[in-house]
Amino acid sequence: EPPTACREKQYLINSQCCSLCQPGQKLVSDCTEFTETECLPCSESEFLDTWNRETRCHQHKYCDPNLGLRVQQKGTSETDTICTCEEGLHCMSESCESCVPHRSCLPGFGVKQIATGVSDTICEPCPVGFFSNVSSAFEKCRPWTSCETKDLVVQQAGTNKTDVVCGPQDRQR
């Protein structure tokens, strides 16, 4: 009886169970009653990452420098090229087809997590007791100055955008 299902790493064609091609190789010819599946390695700029019956290998991804991309990991016959973004840029999407500049955290916000090649800057509002007076992709919220430790008093309260202003204590005569 001809098979209706095949083992793992096989496929059914013309009532025959044929071996799939291993990762890094493409199908040249299906198996027959007389022959095993014929496979050929992908060329240098191509890959296939699964056991397959593809007659064409996939082209490696191109990391286009005009889109701010560079190669993070060179592709092999079994893996695609992995692109990442140049310094100061991050991927626009998960597939990283182009890059955009990291965003800066506006005054009143500090950097919670510095951007990487694949993720944007994460900002957080400065909580009470902290401030940020710059627009920056690196600066965290800084604590207000402690006037007391300098033997000074608060002359102007701090905000999330400004530090406190300290001044001398009024001396009582």
Epitope: N14, S15, Q16, S29, D30, E33, T35
Partner: antibody, heavy 115, light 112 residues
């Protein structure tokens, strides 16, 4: 239905070349290798080699590597075998054959090499 | 090259008899994929060969079940349980495990 059509006979002079044809029909030509087999009276059968019409890739019996050239014309679904520097030893019936989902043979071309 | 040796060269039988043809190879025909690419076919006078059995024991579509193949490694047998007139001709074994593919010399099945 699958058919492999071959001319019935060819008569050629010693030292000359001949190009035998095998026209395929009834299936997708590029999906299956075409193989060639030689049969001389009282000498049994010999496998010459095969060609993959998809990419023109060949595999050969070393014995026939310098004698036979295998090609295909995808536009006409025809496989060819050219035999060169013919001698009386090349006089034989030449079959083309295809397998995969059944085995199919042409009717054979009788090649006579004679002056 | 793998040498395929068929015996007998000639096999006279009476119609209705059982016939048995042997084929031995000079090396194992077990492929690394687990298949054994040993095949049988029949050639009648003036005709192209007609395949009967592939991979030792699998009958091609339309081949009567009186034909059966068996064996492994280097030793193979084709049996015809009840010979009919249409079965007469030359039987060949062939192997496609190793390149070049090779054929047995043939066994002529004829009437006693």
């Amino acid at each position: 239905q699958v058919q492999l059509q071959q001319p019935g006979a060819e008569l050629v002079k010693p030292g000359a070349s001949v190009k035998l044809s095998c026209k395929a029909s009834g299936y997708t030509f590029i999906s299956y290798y075409i193989y060639w087999v030689k049969q001389r009276p009282g000498q049994g059968l010999e496998w010459i080699g095969g060609i993959n019409p998809r990419n023109g890739g060949t595999n050969f019996n070393e014995k026939f590597k310098s004698k036979a050239t295998l090609t295909v014309d995808k536009s006409s679904s025809t496989a060819y075998m050219q035999l060169s520097s013919l001698t009386s030893e090349d006089s034989a019936v030449y079959y083309c054959t295809r397998h995969g989902n059944g085995v199919y043979w042409g009717q054979g071309t009788t090649l006579t090499v004679s002056s | 090259d793998v040498v395929m040796t068929q015996t007998p060269l000639s096999l006279p039988v009476s119609l209705g008899d059982q016939a048995s043809i042997s084929c031995r190879s000079s090396q194992s025909l077990l492929h690394s994929n687990g298949n054994t690419y040993l095949h049988w076919y029949l050639q009648k006078p003036g005709q192209s060969p007609n395949h009967l059995i592939y991979q030792v024991s699998n009958r091609f579509s339309g081949v009567p079940d009186r034909f059966s193949g068996s064996g492994s490694g280097t030793d193979f047998t084709l049996k015809i349980s009840r010979v009919e007139a249409e079965d007469l001709g030359v039987y060949f074994c062939s192997q496609t495990t190793h390149v070049p593919w090779t054929f047995g010399g043939g066994t002529k099945l004829e009437i006693k």
